[in-house]
């Protein structure tokens, strides 16, 4: 989580970069454009961000507001169980895979899907207004 | 409309090699994992092999292991299955799938199918 | 490697019949489970996923089900295109299995 400040009731909020979306705490980027999972993770790190690592369901409602039908690729893969990127359990939600190639995660405005991670698809990046601090 | 039509079928005499093509349309052929299924005649349904959206996972059953190579080419929109040290019991329709996106290995999707007859 | 068994092999029956196909699975594969319907001369059709979900366009008078071991495919009123035989597949992992089939004919 980003440390430092309670973003919601400090006087001037940090402020996301150009064409990322401010949503209480954090910074989200939504493509426009198709990746496959690996290249997704390469463009949101070399924006000093990550592939959304959703934290709670309340998080997850929130930003489906904001996705269709069509998936995201999001920090989740399974790796001997679903984790997030940061280590943690996919603990507040179902994800199951339908074949031995369905390892990362992905979301639309209906929930969370497992694929093959070599589909391109779009993605959100996560990260904090201070690209010094945490990234989950 | 998804279209998925083999070719390349026809006789060969044992420990001969075949090459099957499929021709795919009317989807994105390069977001969908790709599939060889056969059926040798009055049988059953026998996987044959499938290949990854990039090509480079292939998968296959002991029985053509080491004998018949799946590969792909996603800018012809193309599937290919190249079948080598060909036996009698190959002997069989080979249909071209694919599967129901996402890398769900099911055949959602299937050709019309083309016919090997390995025969002296 | 995993098994699928169905059973009859065969089976006669007339329009407007209820009708059950059973596979089985040598493990437990969960719900990694498809239905396929195929009449002579022609390619496969597939008709069902995870055993229960229905393909697009598949009529509802097809359903499946069971988990772990044990599934069905039940028709609920026999009409005439559905003389064909009918296949079950694994579809988790390699190898993809199919069941050896299940001809259903007009009684």
């Known amino acids: 989580l980003c440390q430092g400040s309670n973003y919601s009731t400090c006087a001037s909020c940090p402020s996301c970069p150009d064409r990322w979306m401010k949503y209480g705490n954090h910074c989200y980027y939504f493509s426009v454009e198709e990746k496959d999972w690996n290249s997704s993770l390469e463009f949101c790190l070399a924006r000093d961000s990550h592939l959304l690592v959703i934290t709670d369901n309340q998080e997850m409602s929130l930003l489906q507001v904001f996705l269709s039908e069509a998936f995201c690729w999001i920090g989740l893969r399974n790796n001997s169980g679903w984790r997030w990127e940061d280590g943690s359990p996919l603990n507040f939600s179902r994800i199951s895979s339908n074949s031995f190639v369905q390892t990362c995660g992905a979301i639309n405005k209906n929930g969370l899907q497992a694929s093959s991670c070599e589909v391109p698809l779009h993605w959100v990046c996560k990260k904090c207004p201070f690209a010094d601090q945490a990234l989950f | 409309e998804v279209q998925l039509v083999e070719s390349g079928g026809g006789l060969v005499k044992p420990g001969g090699s075949l090459r099957l093509s499929c021709a795919a349309s009317g989807f994105t052929f390069s977001r969908y994992y790709m599939s060889w299924v056969r059926q040798a005649p009055g049988k059953g349904l026998e996987w044959v092999a499938t290949?990854?959206?990039?090509?480079?996972?292939?998968y296959y059953p002991d029985s053509v292991k080491g004998r018949f190579t799946i590969s792909r080419d996603n800018a012809k929109n193309t599937l290919y299955l190249q079948m080598s040290s060909l036996r009698a019991e190959d002997t069989a329709v080979y249909y071209c799938?694919?599967?129901?996106?996402?890398?769900?290995?099911?055949?959602?999707?299937w050709g019309q199918g083309t016919l090997v007859t390995v025969s002296s | 490697d995993i098994q699928m068994t169905q059973s009859p092999s065969s089976l006669s029956a007339s329009v407007g019949d209820r009708v059950t196909i059973t596979c089985r699975a040598s493990e437990n594969i969960y719900s990694a489970l498809a239905w396929y319907q195929q009449k002579p001369g022609k390619a496969p059709k597939f008709l069902i996923h995870?055993?229960?979900t229905l393909a697009e366009g598949v009529p509802s008078r097809f359903s499946g089900s069971g988990s772990g071991t044990d599934f069905t495919l039940t028709i609920s009123s026999l009409q005439p295109e559905d003389f064909a035989t009918y296949y079950c597949q694994y579809h988790y992992g390699i190898p993809f299995t199919f069941g050896q089939g299940t001809k259903l004919e007009i009684k």
């Open positions: 995870n055993v229960k």
């Open positions: 799938a694919r599967e129901g996106g996402y890398g769900n290995l099911w055949f959602a999707y």
């Open positions: 290949i990854s959206i990039s090509g480079g996972n292939t």
